[in-house]
């Protein structure tokens, strides 16, 4: 549900297409100032289930760059960093939201779409044993 | 960098604020055809570092749902379904875009914003630091 | 030119045991995961046993727990299977196949095999 | 151990014609399906890896999808020299499971 009423100080808008098309302020507001994510950027070494990080570029875009992961392995990592064939890395994967220009090249306008990006990777059990 | 030459056939808009304000179409474009999200959807529960989803709820936002995972053990399950404190769980974590109504309860016009979401967790080695 | 080319088969009484070897060439043996997989006369494909890279993985599915150990001499770019205690359901043609990867998922490349005849 | 139910166990075919072959797994395998050719007296040849990704060299009318439990393997228009059994392979589980294989004749 995006559809709220409106304030008399909002900006104006014509209400035949609302809310089809809103202005976006691009002047990011960064809300993150209390975690500092790169606390995070090891895990993709050290994780039984640990993954590579490809560097996704599309100038059409905004974010222009994504960073998607692709698990290194298959099965899982032992702690004596051989492999458990009994145990399967997997991506996690998120949608998120980004910026697609339309039309193509123009700078001020946009339209929102829903991408699936992998994250990171996580080790699982390949079966589930189900209990009568 | 978001700035590319404009094609005639762009909407107009004043070079001066330009690219503070754009204008972004909300009907969105789902590129997911050929992947299915819900295919991961059981990995929170077959990880060797299983989370729960908390729903954050915020109608300033857009989305205004958004799903926050938070890991259920600080260290990490084994086969047996004990847990092996010698491992870490720990939350892989993700910048994304959302949208914030600017001003407040303004239905068309919104603030570009990252916020920090925590995806799923993993597994990883904990870092021992050795004493001299 | 990746090659895989077994050796050993033959045709042995039930109990007794048998050695294969499959001698690796054109490509970089020690960074590969290898397979044993085979086929009775007639039938589909099965698989017996995998190793890692480094040797210190392996895997055997249940009908040959037990009895049969895969190793490798990686000096040797040379993937071993020693099969124990052979039955007469063990008859088939043996091949050595390497996994794209490092650990023994899916095989890119095969040996032309090895026929292992149990019978008495 | 998961369960690869391939079929049909055999086909007869014209040059030209499209040629389809399923596989079905016990339960979801998570795309982790390959796909090999196996021509009489030789070794198997990896087609398709990770249920739809075409091995290099591999001929462009060979194609396999599908996700979860159900997978496609298909040939858009058969030629002579695909005459083979298929079978397709699980690695999302060990013990490794193949199907029971498909043979593709020419009519």
């Known amino acids: 549900g995006i559809a709220i009423p409106r304030n008399s100080g909002c900006p104006n808008s014509e209400d035949k297409n609302f809310p089809r098309t809103v202005m976006v302020n691009l002047n990011i507001h960064n809300r993150n100032t209390s975690t500092n994510p790169k606390r995070s950027s090891d895990y993709y070494n050290r994780s039984t289930s640990p993954w590579n990080l490809h560097r996704n570029e599309d100038p059409e875009r905004y974010p222009s760059v994504i960073w998607e992961a692709k698990c290194r392995h298959l099965g899982c990592v032992k702690a004596d960093g051989n492999v458990d064939y009994h145990m399967n890395s997997v991506p996690i994967q998120q949608e998120i939201l980004v910026l697609r220009r339309e039309p193509r090249h123009c700078p001020n306008s946009f339209r929102l779409e829903k991408i699936l990006v992998s994250v990171g990777c996580t080790c699982v059990t390949p079966i589930v044993h189900h209990v009568a | 960098g978001i700035a590319i030459p404009r094609n005639s056939g762009c909407p107009n808009s004043e070079d001066k604020n330009f690219p503070r304000t754009v204008m972004v179409n909300l009907n969105i474009h789902n590129r997911n055809t050929s992947t299915n999200p819900k295919r991961s959807s059981d990995y929170y529960n077959r990880s060797t570092s299983p989370w729960n989803l908390h729903r954050n709820e915020d109608p300033e936002r857009y989305p205004s749902v958004i799903w926050e995972a938070k890991c259920r053990h600080l260290g990490c399950v084994k086969a047996d379904g004990n847990v092996d404190y010698h491992m870490n769980s720990v939350p892989i974590q993700q910048e994304i875009l959302v949208l914030r109504r600017e001003p407040r309860h303004c239905p068309n016009s919104f603030r570009l914003e990252k916020i920090l979401v925590s995806v799923g967790c993993t597994c990883v080695t904990p870092i021992v630091h050795h004493v001299a | 030119e990746v090659q895989l080319v077994e050796s050993g088969g033959g045709v042995v009484q039930p109990g007794r045991s048998l050695r294969l070897s499959c001698a690796a060439s054109g490509f970089t043996f020690s960074t590969y995961g290898m397979s044993w997989v085979r086929q009775a006369p007639g039938k589909g494909l099965e698989l017996v046993a995998i190793i890692n890279h480094n040797g210190g993985s392996t895997f055997y599915p249940d009908s040959v727990k037990g009895r049969f150990t895969i190793s490798r001499d990686n000096s040797k770019n040379t993937l071993y299977l020693q099969m124990n205690s052979l039955r007469a359901e063990d008859t088939a043609v043996y091949y050595c196949?390497?996994?794209?990867?490092?650990?023994?998922?899916?095989?890119?490349?095969w040996g032309q095999g090895t026929l292992v005849t149990v019978s008495s | 151990d998961i369960q690869m139910t391939q079929s049909p166990s055999s086909l007869s075919a014209s040059v030209g014609d499209r040629v389809t072959i399923t596989c079905q797994a016990s339960?979801?395998?998570?795309?982790?399906l390959a796909w090999y050719q196996q021509k009489p007296g030789k070794a198997p040849k990896l087609l398709i890896s990770g249920a739809t990704s075409l091995e290099t060299g591999v001929p462009s009318r060979f194609s396999g999808s599908g996700s979860g439990k159900d997978y496609t393997f298909t040939i858009s228009s058969l030629q002579p020299e695909d005459i083979a059994t298929y079978y397709c392979q699980q690695y999302w589980s060990v013990p490794w499971t193949f199907g029971g294989g498909t043979k593709v004749e020419i009519k």
């Open positions: 339960e979801d395998i998570y795309d982790r």
């Open positions: 196949a390497r996994d794209p990867r490092h650990d023994g998922y899916f095989f890119d490349y």
